[in-house]
């Protein structure tokens, strides 16, 4: 018979036949034959194959390294790699998250529109009328100016994006 | 900075239990394996056995099962390793250790020498 | 359960000269890790994955092998180098150590 020129799914083709790929976990030793399977060892500790693969080498578990402000979100198998995100406080800095860097703080007169997570930065939005922040903070929203008419009293100094409103009693006229 | 700190030596008679600890430091003791391996004097190392404190899964060597019972509690980071019905072949030198990547550095404790005489 | 054999069991070499550990395993594993322990102290990782140097260990070393063969080389024996030396594999449970070799220094 003609030798095949493609193989099937979790097969390749060496040596003009098919051979079966090795599982997830497992890395090649030798290459099948007319007479003998693909030979196939799992990965050891601290290492991984996450496909159907034909590698002679396990890839070794990235490390959360916590001098780069790294921890583990999950550990390795012998199927998958560990996921790295970052210690409280702290973004990666890439999709990798090789490394973090802190998460920024929205200056007064900016809130926070959505707070940061382990893989995001802090997202700020400036103050719209009405409404202010008077502190530099990663967490804080703007916060609205107080109603002085909800208190039966009035405005006696107006507020910007940066301080609230100062309430005042309201002059009462006399008789 | 990495560190696995081991509890003190230990002086046991025979028949009695010992528990040693491995306090880490550096990282969270549930991200990591957690090995054990014994030394004898003017012996070479023998694996014991590890565990994954994330959960308590534990592996050990038939050779130490029923005499060595590895625990840990992710709280203190710390992992313990109870010796039962001590004999004197069981005084050595007791080495924690993580997995191998941990930095590349695969930490070692400092050892703890349990002696078992009457 | 896998045994690790190293040889020699004992060896001393000369300053400057080239030293071989090997460690053969009765079936293959996926790699070797080797350590270095010198008298009273902790045991060293000092090369994983069978080829990679641990941090801080120097480049005279170099580690090879695969399946059930694997070796330890030095360039060019150092009196610091004189240390015993063990082999482990961690790929199947449970986990065994090869019996050490002890280089002493000429």
């Known amino acids: 018979p003609e030798p095949p020129t493609a193989c099937r799914e979790k097969q390749y083709l060496i040596n003009s036949q098919c051979c079966s790929l090795c599982q997830p976990g497992q890395k090649l030793v030798s290459d099948c034959t007319e007479f003998t399977e693909t030979e196939c060892l799992p990965c050891g500790e601290s290492e991984f194959l996450d496909t159907w693969n034909r590698e002679t080498h396990c890839h070794q578990h990235k490390y959360c390294d916590p001098n780069l402000g790294l921890r583990v979100q999950q550990k390795g198998t012998s199927e998958t790699d560990t996921i790295c995100t970052c210690e409280e406080g702290w973004h990666c800095t890439s999709e990798a998250c090789e490394s973090c860097v802190l998460h920024r703080s929205c200056s007064p007169g900016f809130g926070v529109k959505q707070i940061a997570t382990g893989v995001s930065d802090t997202i700020c939005e400036p103050c719209p009328v009405g409404f202010f922040s008077n502190v530099s903070s990663a967490f804080e929203k703007c916060h609205p100016w107080t109603s002085c008419e909800t208190k039966d009293l009035v405005v006696q100094q107006a507020g910007t994006n940066k301080t609230d409103v100062v309430c005042g009693p309201q002059d009462r006229l006399r008789a | 900075e990495v560190q696995l700190v081991q509890s003190g030596a230990e002086v046991k008679k025979p028949g009695a239990t010992v528990k040693i600890s491995c306090t880490v430091s550096?990282?969270?003791?549930?991200?990591?394996?957690i090995h054990w391996v014994k030394q004898a004097p003017g012996k070479g190392l023998e694996w014991i056995g590890r565990?994954?404190?994330?959960?308590?899964?534990?592996k050990y060597d038939p050779k130490f099962q029923g005499k060595a019972t590895m625990t840990a509690d992710t709280s203190t980071d710390t992992a313990y390793m109870e010796l039962s019905s001590l004999r004197s072949e069981d005084t050595a030198v007791y080495y924690c250790?993580?997995?191998?990547?941990?930095?590349?550095?695969?930490?070692w404790g400092q050892g703890t020498t349990v002696t078992v005489s009457s | 359960q896998i045994v690790l054999t190293q040889s020699p069991t004992i060896m001393s070499a000369s300053p400057g000269e080239k030293v071989i550990i090997t460690c053969s395993a009765t079936?293959?594993?996926?790699?070797i890790l080797w350590f270095q322990q010198k008298p009273g102290t902790s045991p060293k990782l000092w090369i994983y994955s069978t080829s990679n140097l641990a941090s801080g260990v120097p480049a005279r070393f170099s580690g090879s092998g695969s399946g059930a063969s694997y070796s330890l080389t030095i360039s060019r024996m150092e009196a610091e180098d004189a240390a015993t030396y063990y082999c482990?594999?961690?790929?199947?449970?449970?986990?065994?150590f090869g019996g050490g070799t002890k280089l002493e220094i000429k």
């Open positions: 550096g990282f969270n003791i549930k991200d990591y394996y």
């Open positions: 565990i994954d404190p994330e959960d308590g899964d534990t």
């Open positions: 079936s293959s594993v996926s790699y």
């Open positions: 482990q594999q961690r790929t199947f449970y449970p986990y065994t």
């Open positions: 250790t993580t997995s191998y990547y941990v930095g590349t550095y695969g930490y």
